[in-house]
């Protein structure tokens, strides 16, 4: 038994590692193998991650970690039985993907504007917290060319759009994702979709 | 936001015991070490103890064998069972929230060893 | 154990000047493990930087922190009134644990 792909992971800067690796062949990850984990530092312990099968010889683990700072360093152990398959270290602050906002709420009973709110997925005392940027993706379930990104860029979990730069009278869905530029992480995954039907009063035309 | 409010200092005679707590709101308690800080009147900062999440220990040299840090994350507090106390532990006593530096602080509580 | 020493022990300028506070470690220090705390009177110490040089969150920018290796400086770019303190260094090591330095304090010439 050899690891075809060494184990990579990503943080979320809160309490979850995700570590994902490949087999040289089909495995029963969850009864072959064990990754194990300790933080490098002086109070910590020895933990062990018990991986679920992803795919016929890939392998997932989700490590239960103490709230990240940026200097902490993991050593990983990953363990068939007796025999050590493979060594190496983890820095969560250098691989970081957010957790993906919640909460999408669109508002429609402001006057010709619509109000987008999310929540932020960290919480206040988390380093992220204010360091979320977002993007917001609108498109139109009739219409697959009618499709937009938003950047929000400022740290409220918010955009306000003028109603009438959508069509009128159809229907919409909306999502969102975070990243952070102090870490230089990925982007999280999108937030669950939400619906609405857009309408607006068009304005008279003057002749 | 977070806060680290402590309580239990007073005025304990040489070799008597005493208990400190400390409690934690605003952040996961769980998932950080707790420590406790001393300064002697008019002196500088000393480490005295600190805990992982979980349970492991770590004593400065100077109250090992008679300092006990403990935890209960349930209640989200941290606590310091002092014993055999001397004049030289005569102190106020910070519980902080860290790691490998202290980013919050209780407000002190002072413990005076005197006969 | 490794031992931190701070210069120079009070440090007497007028608010507007500049402030170079060092700190001097016994043996090499890692970047990641250096602290900086501010203390007033009465009042608990305040983290400052980590990690050498990072200001903590909701400290002013013209707090700085620099250095490596045995020698560290924390520097006031220009002092504020409320900026008159006693500021103190700290050190983590995986086996000796927790130091801090013996404090400098900034006081009004």
């Known amino acids: 038994m050899k690891v075809l792909q060494e184990p990579t992971c990503v943080s979320d800067y809160m309490s979850i590692s995700t570590c994902e690796w490949k087999m040289n062949g089909p495995t029963n990850c969850s009864t072959e193998l064990r990754l194990l984990y300790q933080l490098v530092f002086l109070l910590s312990e020895a933990h062990t991650c018990i991986p679920e099968n992803n795919g016929g010889a890939g392998c997932v683990c989700h490590l239960l970690m103490d709230d990240v700072v940026s200097a902490d360093n993991y050593t990983l152990d990953l363990w068939a039985g007796q025999q050590l398959l493979w060594k190496g270290s983890f820095k969560p602050s250098e691989h970081v993907k957010p957790r993906a906002p919640g909460n999408l709420t669109v508002h429609t009973n402001v006057s010709d504007t619509l109000l987008l709110t999310w929540s932020n997925p960290y919480p206040p005392d988390n380093y992220l917290y204010n360091h979320l940027t977002y993007a917001v993706n609108i498109w139109s379930e009739n219409d697959p060319a009618d499709f937009r990104i938003y950047n929000v860029t400022y740290l409220e979990p918010s955009l306000r759009i003028a109603a009438s730069t959508l069509k009128s009278g159809i229907s919409y869905r909306a999502r969102v994702r975070a990243w952070a530029q102090c870490y230089n992480t990925t982007w999280s995954e999108w937030s669950p979709s939400t619906k609405w039907h857009n309408s607006y009063r068009e304005p008279f035309e003057q002749h | 936001e977070v806060q680290l409010v402590q309580s239990g200092g007073g005025l304990v005679h040489p070799g008597g015991s005493l208990r400190l707590s400390c409690a934690g709101s605003?952040?996961?308690?769980?998932?950080?070490?707790m420590f406790w800080v001393r300064q002697a009147p008019g002196k500088g900062l000393e480490w005295v103890s600190g805990i992982g999440t979980g349970g492991a220990t770590s004593y400065a040299d100077s109250v090992k064998g008679r300092f006990t840090i403990s935890r209960d994350n349930a209640k989200n507090s941290l606590y310091l069972q002092m014993n055999s106390l001397r004049a030289e532990d005569m102190a106020v006593y910070y519980c902080?929230?860290?790691?490998?530096?202290?980013?919050?602080w209780g407000q002190g509580t002072l413990v005076t060893v005197s006969s | 154990e490794i031992v931190l020493t701070q210069s120079p022990g009070t440090l007497s300028l007028s608010p507007g000047e500049r402030a170079t506070l060092s700190c001097r470690a016994s043996q090499s220090v890692s970047n990641s493990y250096l602290a900086w705390y501010q203390q007033k009177p009465g009042q608990a110490p305040r983290l400052l930087i980590f990690?050498?040089?990072s200001r903590a969150p909701g400290i002013p920018d013209r707090f700085s922190g620099s250095g490596s290796g045995t020698d560290f400086t924390l520097t006031i770019s220009r002092l504020e009134p409320e900026d008159f303190a006693v500021y103190y260094c700290q050190q983590y090591d995986h086996s000796a644990g927790w130091t801090f330095g013996q404090g400098t304090k900034v006081e009004i010439k």
């Open positions: 902080a929230r860290g790691r490998y530096y202290f980013d919050y």
């Open positions: 990690g050498a040089s």
């Open positions: 605003g952040f996961t308690f769980s998932r950080n070490a």
